[in-house]
Structures are given as C-alpha cells and as structure tokens.
Interface confidence: low
Amino acid sequence: EDGGPACYGGFDLYFILDKSGSVLHHWNEIYYFVEQLAHRFISPQLRMSFIVFSTRGTTLMKLTEDREQIRQGLEELQKVLPGGDTYMHEGFERASEQIYYENSQGYRTASVIIALTDGELHEDLFFYSEREANRSRDLGAIVYCVGVKDFNETQLARIADSKDHVFPVNDGFQALQGIIHSILKKSCIEILAAEPSTICAGESFQVVVRGNGFRHARNVDRVLCSFKINDSVTLNEKPFAVEDTYLLCPAPILKEVGMKAALQVSMNDGLSFISSSVIITTTHCSDGS
C-alpha cells in the first residue's frame, strides 16, 4: 500500500460514529476506518473529537490537537462495545456543544463533521437528526455523512450539507477502506502556500493562495482570504477568484519591512477560519526592482 493522500488543513474535525446494536459485528471496520482517516489529517493546528451514539451520544474524546491524546482516543474507540438504538441526533448535539463552547471562548476555527451510520433512521429520529445537523451548520460546521449497508441516501443528503457531501458505502463495512481517499479529498480544506510569500513593503499585491478544497464551501461567494497581521489585527479580503486548488486574493498593504501576515481562509464569510502555517512577510524593494 502506498502512503496515499494527506490533509494539512488546520480546522476542527468531529467524527460522529454509530455504535448501535446493528454494528456489533462490524465495529472493527469502523474503528480502522476512523484510525486510518484520522492519521491523514496531519496539521499541528488540526483538532479532532470522537463522538459515538446509540441510545445516547457520548463524547469519547474532546476536541484536541494533542497527538498523544488522539492516540489514546483511538485506543478508547477500539474498546467500544456497540449496542442500543440509532439516536444520531444525540451525536450532533455533542458536536454542537463543543462548537458552541469553542466559539464562546473566542476561537473562530472552522468545523468539519464526518458522521457515520449504517441504518435507516425512523421518521422521528430522522427529523431530530436533521434538526441537530442544521444547528451544527448554523454554528459554522460543514457536515459530511458516510452511509454503510442499510442507509437511506435521501435522508443522509438532508442531514449532510448536500448530496455531494454523502459517501455511500454499498458493499458493506469491509468497503469502508475504499472511500478513505475520496472522503479525505472532499473533506480536506488546506492552505499549502502563498505566492508570493514575500511582498514589498507599502505596495499593493495580489496573492495566489495554493491549497485544496476551497470550493467545498456551501456558497463560494462566502469564501474569504484572511490576513492576521503581526498576531494582532485581522484583515479579511474577498478573493478575485475561487478555484478548488487556489484563491486569488488582494493582499493587504503592509507598510513596514518585516511585518508578517498569517494566512487563513474562511468558507462562511468570516464566521470561522481554516488556519495554516503559511506566512507572508514584507521586505524592502528598491525602485525598479
């Protein structure tokens, strides 16, 4: 097996996992799917949470960027004994609680939810799940659903952001491994580089922001480039162009040599941000250079 793709995006990733009785003999497949997917999100700024649901929702691992805690969280996930009903809405409630708390602490980090279930939701449970998923969306989250075996794709398309945000696994749990590449590609929003990364002090510039997933936004008109200058002032700029692998953005005019602007991207008009390690710095440019 080759290394496969990875995601360098800095955001908050929530796994909401079905541990109802119907997955009793398939929990290992779910676990290995999460384990392999989790370790492909490699940004030091990425935080992750594991939530399981059956008759109630449980936060198995609170949001953390600590790789040792994530390792321990995966160990806990492996020990889960499935059983109970499919109260998916309880899982979304646990995610929304954390997103709300993080927002209240002043963190405006983008949230991505990957929810996995194996069964059709009974009418009232579907209503609750859609309602709670909408609440997560209102808090700024992007919602993806993975459906395995006996799922209802129409239901999941309404729980997720759209039909394009649903990953159907029709060949049973063993086929979960086969969607890792596609789910990573679709759920990953990452900033990889800025061109140019050094700009002339006091001059106006356009910056090409290289990355992936910029068109995963529900509405590309809400995509913003954000420049956090010298760890203090943040300036948001509307891009001239939004493509999946790059943004063309006006750079703020940075008057002094040595100023630094950390690059972020918002997919929702500034409600929350994808962070990165990409920095734009200013330098002195002599006339005619």
Epitope: G4, A6, E35, Q36, H39, I42, R71, L74
Partner: antibody, heavy 126, light 109 residues
Amino acid sequence: QVQLVQSGGGVVQPGRPLRLSCAASGFNLGSYAMSWVRQAPGKGLEWVSAISGSGGSTYYADSVKGRFTISRDNSKNTLYLQMNSLRAEDTAVYYCAKILGPGNLNYYYYYGMDVWGQGTTVTVSS
Amino acid sequence: SSELTQDPAVSVALGQTVRITCQGDSLRNSYASWYQQKPGQAPVLVIYGNNNRPSGIPDRVSGSRSGNTASLTITGAQAEDEADYYCNSRDSSGNHVVFGGGTELTVLG
C-alpha cells in the same frame, strides 16, 4: 524526560550471537512502534529492523533477514535486537529509535523517528 | 543501493541559505523526515512529516516535498549547523524504512 538507554554492545567473533537492549523511560514503550538503525564506521545510517507497538508486526532489512530478531517486552519497557551469525560487515554503531505516529506499523504513514538511544558499538572481529 | 539519493557534500557561507535535497520514488507516496548528526553523536530529528519541526528545532530550519523530491532548507546558516544530514522515509513497498546516503554540510567563514 523521554529517553532510550542502550546496552549490550561489544566485540564478538564472526558467527557468534549478541543481544542488544534498549530501555525506555518517560513514555510507554507499548504505545509506539520502535526501530533499530545502524551506522558502519565512516558510513551513513542504515535501517535494520522495526516492530509494532504490540510486537505483532516485525520488519527487517534484507541484509539482516533470517539472522536478526527484533522483540520487545512492554512490561519491562525494553526493546531488544538478537543478532545471530554475526559477520564482519555487521560492525557498526547500533541505535534504537522511537517511531513517530501510530503504534501499528501496518499503518500507511511513517513520519520519522523522534527519540534515539545513545548508540552502542558492535565490533565483529576474529 | 539506497532508494533515496542525496548530494554527498554541500557548503554554505555563514548567514546564507542552503538547501539539501533528497530524491526517490518512494517520496511520492510517503513522508520525508530529516536528521542532523554531528560526529560521535546520535542523530537528531529536525523535520518530520515533510515539513514539521519538532520543538527545540529553530525556525530557520524548514522542510518541503514536491513530487519525488524532499528538501531541507536552512536559512541564515550558523556554524553549529555544520553536520551530516540524512533524509528518511518508508520505501516503495511500505514495509521497510530507508535512509538517504547523507549530505555533509560545511559552513564557510
């Protein structure tokens, strides 16, 4: 503090065995995949062997396969390298190292080795 | 023969920028890590996962990967940067680990 302390090196005759030990402190050895790397005098680093956190998966370089055995005793927080049928070309400084990332070495990703032992010299000579 | 190829020696003037490269097909599908080794000492991890610096490594050291080439860049080289540098990744099979042949960095001046 996280560290690896090695022992067991020395001078040994060709064809004879030797066992190297690597004691971990400051972290739970069983949570991490581990590796042995060697460096012949004046040469570069050469990967020798690796083992998963549970000890269930082991891997060897072609140059030592069938002669060397990597093992671990997680209750003692210690990693071992049993070297049999030693040859002159096995003369090197041997390092144990902790592998970054998941303890399951069947995993897709290998990020690097973040903690190294101090090294122990093995000289194979008649 | 090593699956990862490095230039045997590179020199840089004090305070200047130097880039050490590592080539190999395995790098297309795996991460590169970089180690610094000074005479008589154990290697020290300076970059992991292509471009991540462990704590304690100065930010003038950076890493990147493009296609089958990984690069280690030292900006504003200091005398203490003089050492051997090795790249490392999983091999093409994914079951072995492989090191580059090493690059001896000399800081001039």
